[in-house]
Amino acid sequence: MVADPPRDSKGLAAAEPTANGGLALASIEDQGAAAGGYCGSRDQVRRCLRANLLVLLTVVAVVAGVALGLGVSGAGGALALGPERLSAFVFPGELLLRLLRMIILPLVVCSLIGGAASLDPGALGRLGAWALLFFLVTTLLASALGVGLALALQPGAASAAINASVGAAGSAENAPSKEVLDSFLDLARNIFPSNLVSAAFRSYSTTYEERNITGTRVKVPVGQEVEGMNILGLVVFAIVFGVALRKLGPEGELLIRFFNSFNEATMVLVSWIMWYAPVGIMFLVAGKIVEMEDVGLLFARLGKYILCCLLGHAIHGLLVLPLIYFLFTRKNPYRFLWGIVTPLATAFGTSSSSATLPLMMKCVEEKNGVAKHISRFILPIGATVNMDGAALFQCVAAVFIAQLSQQSLDFVKIITILVTATASSVGAAGIPAGGVLTLAIILEAVNLPVDHISLILAVDWLVDRSCTVLNVEGDALGAGLLQNYVDRTESRSTEPELIQVKSELPLDPLPVPTEEGNPLLKHYRGPAGDATVASEKESVM
């Protein structure tokens, strides 16, 4: 049974297959507009604007944020504002971050439990394996691109970053000093949290204490819980718990329905937060620019390094990833990217993959037709382990530091950088203070000095935003690719491989008109397990 389609002003309705093989019901014009297609008549332009309003508002917000930030900086910046006014200035942005972070925990846990429970173990394994393969290959490509660009552009060879003194390199004591082995052991410990409740806000980290043992000072590793959500542990637990619920069969169905309903309610909250996102993004971007001192000097000293990172991110995000997507799907990757402009801008504003997760789920499902059981299973995993941007930046940074300190990189060292960057970026989510610490791990692996990490930190506020955009773009395109893989395997087999557990919801709810893309349809197995019932899920805005 299918709900009545939402009707446009002319009363026309259209049914079109979505990427997940269901039927999306919307006006033909709206579909074209939503996809960023041609808008002809005034009526179509109006509809086009309405369908893309949030995207346009978000883009405007980023531009306005930059302009506002530069304006305030020009008028004296943080010094002129003073701490109190600066705090008030960044408050709208802080509010967005808090709203998004508030939603992460229920969203990740419920979506993964629901996602893992809705797939049969064979499909789950295949889907997971393909996802991890995609994430690994793209991260390795990003690493290779980073090394290649840095070797070609040589940002450190003629850099003015080192022209002052040893002091310019920063105090070595500020550089994280942690054994490579301990970093990976911490990663493993965080995968298996000892306390699920504390994992929601704490992670395990090894620090060191110097102890006097028989007259000699020995550095002893000491484990402790530090502030910061252990997202890796929660992700692993949620997947395993979802699989366990599925194993229970009918007994587990009630709990699966509970998590699915919880997830739906969370997504409703997300759809509300989305409309506040442009305001928050504007002030986040503006606030960061205002907070920065001597931006000009920073660009003069580290301009080539910044250029190298941003250029690498642009090439990977606008050429490499779209090309991979096109080769496997034969679909326009830029249309897909247009559908996720809002989460991409949010990634730039918040500089957090996990904070962008709620909006990304909403957009890939509603704008790009990715099935819920795919997006809600793959995206949280991607946000945790897929770090193309981080891997690329770390490789550029490692080569930059090698050039800066005039240390040559032979083939073995380059391969070591590639492998370590790929491995440590995957594990970064499980390592507190991930970015800088993983860079320190790479530098340690090839015996490069860690002194210059403080230079990298000085521009991290900008490079990290670019990293996050690339990270989340990779997650989304991965979800799109997997959707395509599922579509092909489903069309080949008569028996659908991927089954979603039915939520305890009426099958014909009253449709609520939506502007943010097409209403998403879910596949439900009929009671007898043979008939597939399509049910429209409204998007509450």
Epitope: A160, I162, V166, A172, S405, Q406, Q407, N447
Partner: antibody, heavy 120, light 107 residues
Framework: QIQLVQSGPELKKPGETVKISCKAS????????MSWVKQTPGKGLKWMGW????????IYGDDSKGRFAFSLETSGSIAYLQINNVKNEDTATYFC?????????????WGQGTTLTVSS | DIQMTQITSSLSASLGDRVTISCRAS??????LNWYQQKPDGTVKLLIY???RLHSGVPSRFSGSGSGTDYSLTISNLEQEDIATYFC?????????FGGGTKLEIK
């Protein structure tokens, strides 16, 4: 083989300028950084800083800022240490040392040293 | 800055002896410890880098060991040509710093 040959001993009056040279041979000069190390009888060896031989950018140690200048003549594979307005405490032996590759900060080849005596 | 301490400023030994010179850092230097030999004529040579790696052309009687903050240089079979002053140097962080030196003499 790799060699670093420094200029001869110098005797200067306070306030004068001295320029010590270090000619490298046996390797590609612009591949390795060149460091300068000061040795005084009372204080031992002290790293003064180094020069990035590819870019010509000097990096000075905390005690070497101001009167000290590192420079290069890349075509002749020569590194220079110039001390302006010399003082009595500059009396020491100055070594140029090739900054090695691969294990952070160490110096695999050293010049024979140039003795600077500052006396009025 | 990291302080490097060579407790023994001078050491007397007989030819053929096994001599150990120690060096201590004020903080963990992660094995980035190097040893240099300065002959009486003033020439300086690298002996060992990264705690235990022998520089090319250095006789195998020289060896290095240690970790964390404590390191040592060992000459297994002292020869006449080994009479010199030995310096340790940390290369972990800028600025690189040297120990005060240990002068080795023949008994």
């Amino acid at each position: 083989q790799i060699q670093l040959v420094q200029s001869g001993p110098e005797l200067k009056k306070p306030g004068e300028t001295v320029k010590i040279s270090c000619k490298a041979s046996g390797y590609t000069f612009t591949t390795y950084g060149m460091s300068w190390v000061k040795q005084t009888p009372g204080k031992g060896l002290k790293w003064m800083g180094w020069i990035h031989t590819y870019s010509g950018v000097p990096i000075y140690g905390d005690d070497s800022k101001g009167r000290f200048a590192f420079s290069l003549e890349t075509s002749g594979s020569i590194a220079y240490l110039q001390i302006n307005n010399v003082k009595n405490e500059d009396t020491a032996t100055y070594f140029c040392a090739r900054r090695s590759d691969g294990y952070r900060y160490f110096f695999d080849y050293w010049g024979q040293g140039t003795t600077l005596t500052v006396s009025s | 800055d990291i302080q490097m301490t060579q407790i023994t400023s001078s050491l007397s030994a007989s030819l053929g002896d096994r001599v150990t010179i120690s060096c201590r850092a004020s903080q963990d230097i992660r094995n980035y410890l190097n040893w240099y030999q300065q002959k009486p004529d003033g020439t300086v040579k690298l002996l060992i880098y990264y705690t235990s790696r022998l520089h090319s052309g250095v006789p195998s009687r020289f060896s290095g060991s240690g970790s964390g903050t404590d390191y040592s240089l060992t000459i297994s079979n002292l020869e006449q040509e080994d009479i010199a002053t030995y310096f340790c140097q940390q290369g972990n962080t800028l600025p690189p710093t040297f120990g005060g030196g240990t002068k080795l003499e023949i008994k």
